[in-house]
């Protein structure tokens, strides 16, 4: 988790002087509670946006937006703490909006936005906005949280972001898998324009089960430049196991931009359809 390397992060708007600061996610008001605290944020919205760094790289960011409730507690609102928690790693990053002037009611509802948290493809986050100061230990909570799922690199807009392109998202191998006689599969895919090796992982499963009955890895050496964008054909021999009929083929490249952690592409061959067994014809006809 990190912040986009923007010039200066701003939160000021007409009628409010505000600065964005790094936060330890442990605001002082936790340790020194105040008697009067503001109410919670209203209508917290999280959306996927895209932003360029100063170097011109494109990253997915969480666009966080919320409004204030129209009550007198805005008189005690000193700022907000924005927290993003990556759920699979428990990594948390916070920033603090520090209001340098008092808020006053005006003809429009106060609205705040922040779009500088860089998020990763295919990850889920919990986004929390805490109004400051935080409530006293038994006080009503004054925060709002929402979960936010970032699409993976198959998503059209995500595909062209720097993290996705670095992991090989622009390569479309167009995998085809054909079942041959004598327990064999022919796998065909398009090579990328890089002299790098690939590995094919074949995993076979029984019909309707997720425990594999066979796993086979096949290595494909780096192609020569004249083979770039050509189709590579590989014949894999299956184990002759009864019922081990559903096959998943995964292709992992080793591109220089992602080394041994590149995106995999996969294709699946289903078990052959079993013909419906016809109703047995009775050898006598009932007379009623």
């Amino acid at each position: 988790l990190r912040l986009l390397d923007h010039r200066a992060l701003v939160c000021s708007q007409p009628g409010l002087n505000c600065t964005v600061k790094n936060s330890t996610c442990l605001d002082d008001s936790w340790i020194h509670p105040r008697n009067l605290t503001p109410s919670s944020p209203k209508d917290l919205q999280i959306q996927l946006h895209f932003a360029h760094t100063q170097q011109g790289d494109l990253f997915p960011v969480a666009h966080i937006e919320w409004t204030l409730q129209t009550d007198a507690s805005i008189l005690y609102l000193e700022g907000a703490e924005l927290s993003v928690l990556q759920l699979n790693t428990n990594e948390r990053l916070c920033v603090r909006f520090e209001f340098l002037s008092k808020l006053r009611h005006h003809h429009r509802r106060w609205r705040f936005t922040f779009s500088h948290f860089v998020v990763d493809p295919d990850q889920e986050y919990e986004v929390t906005v805490h109004h400051l100061p935080k409530p006293i230990p038994d006080g009503d909570p004054n925060h709002q949280s929402k979960n936010f799922l970032v699409p993976d690199c198959e998503h059209a807009r995500m595909k062209v972001t720097t993290p996705c392109m670095s992991s090989g998202s622009l390569w479309d191998p167009n995998i085809t898998v054909e079942t041959l006689e004598a327990h064999q599969l022919r796998v065909s895919f398009t090579l990328w324009n890089e002299s790098t090796h690939y590995q094919i992982l074949l995993t076979s499963f029984p019909h309707m089960e997720n425990h594999s009955c066979f796993e086979h890895m096949h290595h494909i050496p780096a192609p020569r430049p004249e083979e770039f964008h050509q189709r590579s054909n590989v014949t894999l021999t299956l184990r002759n196991l009864k019922g081990c009929c559903r096959h998943q083929v995964q292709i992992q490249p080793f591109f220089s931009s992602c080394l041994n952690d590149c995106l995999r592409h996969s294709a699946t061959v289903s078990c052959p359809e079993m013909p419906d067994t016809p109703e047995p014809i009775p050898d006598y006809m009932p007379l009623w």
């Epitope: 992982l201 796993e215 086979h216 890895m217």
Partner: nanobody
Framework: EVQLVESGGGLVQPGGSLRLSCTAS????????MAWYRQAPGKQRDFVAT???????NYADSVKGRFTISRDNPKRTVNLQMNSLKPEDTAVYYC???????WGQGTQVTVSS
């Protein structure tokens, strides 16, 4: 979650032998294909050998006839027996479980007189 730990690396003279081991903890082992890769300084990580769930093996051309990959399912280990070692075999050797792209931390092999 599976973890892979390699051992057995070291310094050996050309023509010598070494036996590398990779021990897996956690996750499924018996049914998983396993592989060895190596990475020489400043080079890309390269395939060395693989052993499939059935025990069938596959080798890079550069090590065929010299290296042998084997597995011991009860001990959850994959071994790489390396004979007739050459200076160009010098690299960090990594164990890999392709199923979930898990890698060990690597073990250094140096072939030098």
């Amino acid at each position: 979650e599976v973890q892979l730990v390699e051992s057995g690396g070291g310094l050996v003279q050309p023509g010598g032998s070494l036996r590398l081991s990779c021990t897996a903890s956690g996750g499924v082992f018996n049914g998983a294909a396993m592989a060895w890769y190596r990475q020489a300084p400043g080079k890309q990580r390269d395939f060395v050998a693989t052993i499939n769930s059935s025990g069938s093996t596959n080798y890079a051309d550069s090590v065929k006839g010299r290296f042998t990959i084997s597995r011991d399912n009860p001990k959850r280990t994959v071994n790489l027996q390396m004979n007739s070692l050459k200076p160009e075999d010098t690299a960090v050797y990594y164990c890999n479980r392709p199923r979930d792209n898990t890698w060990g931390q690597g073990t250094q092999v140096t072939v030098s007189s």
